[in-house]
Interface confidence: low
C-alpha cells in the first residue's frame, strides 16, 4: 500500500504536484509499512476499541487563511474521554475524584508507555528497536525526552505527507511560496503504541484557504453608537477605522503597507500608512466604503524579456464578493480564482511583487445624540423634620437627536458599585434640555452617570456629587 | 437554488429496514458534510452521524451503530441513511443537513425531514 | 457524550421583551456551539455559529455568546414571528449533542 491509499482524501492531479511541493514532506506515493502500521477500513470492529473508555477525538486548527508566500500553522489536540488526561510522563492517566460512566475514578494509569516493562522497546541498535519507526519506515528522531511522545501524527495535504512524534498535542507549519491559491484540504490521523506497533485512534481534517490577495478586516467603533455591529453611525461624529491584517506568521512585518480609503461621500481618496483613521460623515445617508491595502512582498523575479510591458500602475480590481453560505469567524477570504502561482526557485535577485487586499462596507449614517453634559444641580428644599433621604434636581442638556429615554446610576465615588440604576421615557423640549429628580440616601459623596439613548446612539457624562449631612450650614458639592 | 429534498412519509413493518434518500442540488455535494438528525414527536434533536462525499469518510454516534448506516451515491449527489431492524423507538422525522468542512457541526441548510411510522 | 443541559424549557413573552437562553456543556467545548430555531411543523434552522456569530440573513435582534462550558443566546426585542423551539448544539466533541430545547410562546 502507498500513502494515498491509506490516508484517503481524493487524489491530487500529478500536475499539480509539481507546482505545490512542502519543503520537508514526502510524496503520498510512499510506501505505508503495514505491518507496523496496521490499515483498518472504515466500519472496521477494531476502531471502536482502539482506545480505553471511549474515542478519542483530535481537534485540528489553523491560522488560515494564508497569503501566498508565508507560513501557515496547523495544530493538532487530542480530547481524551472524560476523565482521561495525560501526565507529566506522557503516560494516560485517569483524574482523581472524577465521575466518568464507570464512576468516580481513582488516579490509575489508562496507558502507562513509559514504565518499567516497556523499557527494553526503547533501546537503541538493538533489533528490538526496529518497530520505533514511521509508517515509511524512517526511525523516530531521539530528541531529550522523546520516550515521552507516545502519538504518531502523519499529516496529508497537496499529495505529501508529514510524519511527527508528539504528546497530545501536534504543530506543523508550512510555508506557502510555492503553493496555489485556493482551498485545499489537511487531513491528520494519529496513532498510539500497541505493543509494537501502532493503532489508529483518530482522523480529522480541515479545509484552509491560501489566497494570493491580504486578508483584511476592518474594525468601526464611534464614540455614543449604540450598536457597534450593526454598522449603522452617527453624523457629525468621527467614526475610527482600525485594519486588522491577518498575518499570523509576520510575513509582512518588513513591508511597508499603504492604505487607500474611500469612504463614499465625494471626499475624495485618503492615502495612509497608518492601519487606523479617523473619518466624519457630515451627511445622512448610506455610503459605500472602500478600503484597499497595499504592500510589496518578495516574490518570483520575472524572466528577463525585451518583449514584457511594465506591470500596471493600477492595482486589479477586486472580485465580486459571493455572499458565503457560511461566513467564517474571524477576518476571511475566499479566493479569488484559483490561479496558479508558478514560482520556480527563487534566485538571489530581490524582486518583490505588489500584493492587494480588499475590504468593502456599506454603512449608514444617521442622526444621533453627540453630547450631554449637566448645566445644573440643585438641592430640592425638603420640610422639617427632615426625612434621611436627600432629594436632587439635575438639569440636563443635550445636543444632536432627541433622546427617548434617560438613565441615571448612582454608584460609589469609584463610579464603579452601582447602587441604583433608574431608567424612564423622556419627553425633552426642542432645546434637549430635561430635568431629573433623583433622591440619595444619606451624606456622601456618589458618582452619578447619565446616558441619554435614543435607536442609534447611546450618549453619557459623569459627576461626583457630594451629599452634604444634616447641618443646615453644609453646602452641596458637585466635583464634574 | 440549494435545496436538499427528502422524500415524504415512509410507512414500515416491525423488524424491517428502510433507506431514506436526501437529493441535494446548487451546492459543491462533494465538499460538505452530510448530517442525518432524527426528532421523535415533541421531542428534541438527535444527532446520527455525519458522511463526507468527498471521500465516503464517517463520523457516527456510537447509539446508532448496527441501527443507521450512512452511504453516498457522488453520480446524483444523493445521500442515504438505511435504518434496520426497525421498532417503534424508531419513528420519527429523519432530517438531512449539510454542514461545512471546517464547521462540521455547523448545519447551515435542512432537508425538510422524512417521517417515518413504523406500524404492524 | 457531552451533555448539554439548556434553560428554561418554556418562556411566555411578550412582544417586545428581552428574552435570554442559556446552555450548559457537561466539559469544555470551546467555542463550538450553535444555535437553531425550529418553527412548528418546519426544519430547524442554523441561527448562531461558533458560539457568537449570527449567520447569513438572520435578524440582529439574535445574539449569542459564550465559551467553555456556559453558552447564552439572546432576542433583544421578541416579535411574533420568534414563536419557536430553540436549541443549542456542541460540535466540538462527537457525537454532537443537543439542547432539550427551549419553547417560546408569544402572550
Known amino acids: 500500500k502507498r500513502f494515498r491509499d491509506v490516508l484517503g482524501h481524493e487524489q491530487y492531479p500529478d500536475h499539480m504536484r509539481e507546482h505545490n511541493q512542502l519543503r520537508g514532506w514526502s510524496s503520498d506515493e510512499n510506501e505505508w509499512d503495514e505491518h507496523l502500521y496496521p490499515v483498518w477500513r472504515r466500519g472496521d470492529g477494531r476502531w471502536k476499541d482502539s482506545w480505553e473508555g471511549g474515542r478519542v477525538q483530535a481537534v485540528l486548527t489553523s491560522d488560515s487563511p494564508a497569503l501566498v508566500g508565508s507560513n501557515i500553522t496547523f495544530v493538532v489536540n487530542l480530547v481524551f474521554p472524560r476523565c482521561q488526561k495525560e501526565d507529566a510522563n506522557g503516560n494516560i492517566v485517569y483524574e482523581k475524584n472524577c465521575r466518568n460512566d464507570l464512576g468516580l475514578t481513582s488516579d490509575l494509569h489508562v496507558y502507562n508507555w513509559t514504565a518499567g516493562a516497556d523499557d527494553g522497546d526503547w533501546e537503541d541498535g538493538t533489533s528490538r528497536s526496529q518497530h520505533l519507526r514511521f509508517p515509511d519506515r524512517r526511525p523516530f528522531p531521539r530528541p531529550h525526552g522523546w520516550k515521552k511522545w507516545s502519538f504518531v501524527y502523519v499529516f496529508h495535504t497537496l499529495g505529501q505527507y508529514f510524519q511527527k512524534l508528539g504528546r497530545c498535542s501536534a504543530r506543523v507549519s508550512i510555508n506557502t511560496v510555492n503553493l496555489t491559491a485556493g482551498p485545499q484540504v489537511m487531513e491528520v490521523t494519529v496513532f498510539r503504541r500497541y505493543g509494537r506497533a501502532y493503532i489508529p485512534i483518530s482522523k480529522v481534517k480541515d479545509v484552509y484557504v491560501i489566497t494570493d490577495q491580504i486578508p483584511v478586516f476592518v474594525t468601526m467603533s464611534q464614540k455614543n453608537d449604540r450598536n457597534l455591529s450593526d454598522e449603522i453611525f452617527l453624523r457629525d461624529l468621527p467614526i475610527v477605522f482600525d485594519v486588522l491584517i491577518h498575518d499570523p506568521s509576520h510575513f509582512l512585518n518588513d513591508s511597508a503597507i499603504s492604505y487607500k480609503w474611500n469612504f463614499g461621500d465625494n471626499t475624495g481618496l485618503f492615502v495612509s500608512n497608518n492601519h487606523t483613521l479617523n473619518h466624519t460623515y457630515v451627511l445622512n445617508g448610506t455610503f459605500n466604503l472602500n478600503l484597499t491595502v497595499q504592500t510589496a512582498v518578495p516574490g518570483p523575479c520575472p524572466p528577463p524579456s525585451p518583449s514584457t510591458p511594465p506591470p500596471p500602475s493600477t492595482p486589479p480590481s477586486p472580485p465580486p464578493s459571493p455572499l458565503p453560505t457560511l461566513s467564517t469567524p474571524s477576518p476571511s477570504l475566499m479566493p479569488t480564482g484559483y490561479k496558479s502561482m508558478e514560482l520556480s526557485d527563487i534566485s538571489n535577485e530581490n524582486c518583490r511583487i505588489n500584493r492587494y487586499g480588499y475590504f468593502r462596507a456599506t454603512i449608514t449614517i444617521v442622526e444621533g445624540i453627540l453630547e450631554v453634559s449637566i448645566m445644573q444641580i440643585a438641592d430640592v428644599p425638603m420640610p422639617t423634620p427632615q426625612p434621611a433621604n436627600s432629594l436632587m434636581d439635575f438639569t440636563v442638556t443635550c445636543k444632536g437627536a432627541t433622546p427617548m429615554e434617560a438613565c441615571t446610576i448612582i454608584s460609589d465615588p469609584t463610579c464603579q458599585i452601582a447602587q441604583n440604576r433608574v431608567c424612564s421615557p423622556v419627553a425633552v423640549d426642542g432645546l434637549c434640555l430635561l430635568s431629573v429628580r433623583r433622591a440619595f440616601n444619606g451624606s456622601g459623596t456618589y458618582c452619578v452617570n447619565f446616558t441619554l439613548g435614543d435607536d442609534a446612539s447611546l450618549a453619557l457624562t459623569s459627576t461626583l456629587i457630594s451629599i452634604p449631612g444634616k447641618d443646615p450650614d453644609s453646602p452641596l458639592r458637585a466635583v464634574n | 437554488q440549494l435545496q436538499l429534498q427528502q422524500s415524504g412519509t415512509e410507512v414500515v413493518k416491525p423488524g424491517a429496514s428502510v433507506k431514506i434518500p436526501c437529493k441535494a442540488s446548487?451546492?459543491?455535494?462533494?465538499?460538505?458534510?452530510m448530517n442525518w438528525v432524527k426528532q421523535r414527536p415533541g421531542k428534541g434533536l438527535e444527532w446520527i452521524g455525519q458522511i463526507y462525499p468527498g471521500d465516503g469518510d464517517t463520523n457516527d454516534n456510537g447509539k446508532f451503530e448496527g441501527k443507521a448506516t450512512l452511504t453516498v451515491d457522488k453520480s446524483s449527489n444523493t445521500a442515504y441513511i438505511q435504518l434496520s431492524s426497525l421498532t417503534s423507538e424508531d419513528s420519527a422525522v429523519y432530517f438531512c443537513a449539510r454542514s461545512p468542512l471546517h464547521l462540521r457541526g455547523s448545519m447551515d441548510y435542512w432537508g425538510q425531514g422524512t417521517s417515518v411510522t413504523v406500524s404492524s | 457524550s457531552i451533555v448539554m443541559t439548556q434553560t428554561p424549557k418554556f418562556l411566555l413573552v411578550s412582544a417586545g421583551d428581552r428574552v435570554t437562553i442559556t446552555c450548559k456543556a457537561s466539559?469544555?467545548?470551546?467555542?463550538?456551539v450553535a444555535w437553531f430555531q425550529q418553527k412548528p411543523g418546519q426544519s430547524p434552522e442554523l441561527l448562531i455559529y461558533s458560539a457568537s456569530n449570527r449567520y447569513t440573513g438572520v435578524p440582529d435582534r439574535f445574539t449569542a455568546s459564550g465559551y467553555g462550558t456556559d453558552f447564552t443566546f439572546t432576542i433583544s426585542a421578541v416579535q411574533a414571528e420568534d414563536l419557536a423551539v430553540y436549541f443549542c448544539q456542541q460540535n466540538y466533541y462527537s457525537p454532537f449533542t443537543f439542547g432539550g430545547g427551549t419553547r417560546l410562546e408569544i402572550k
Open positions: 446548487g451546492y459543491a455535494f462533494s465538499s460538505y458534510w
Open positions: 466539559q469544555s467545548v470551546s467555542n463550538d
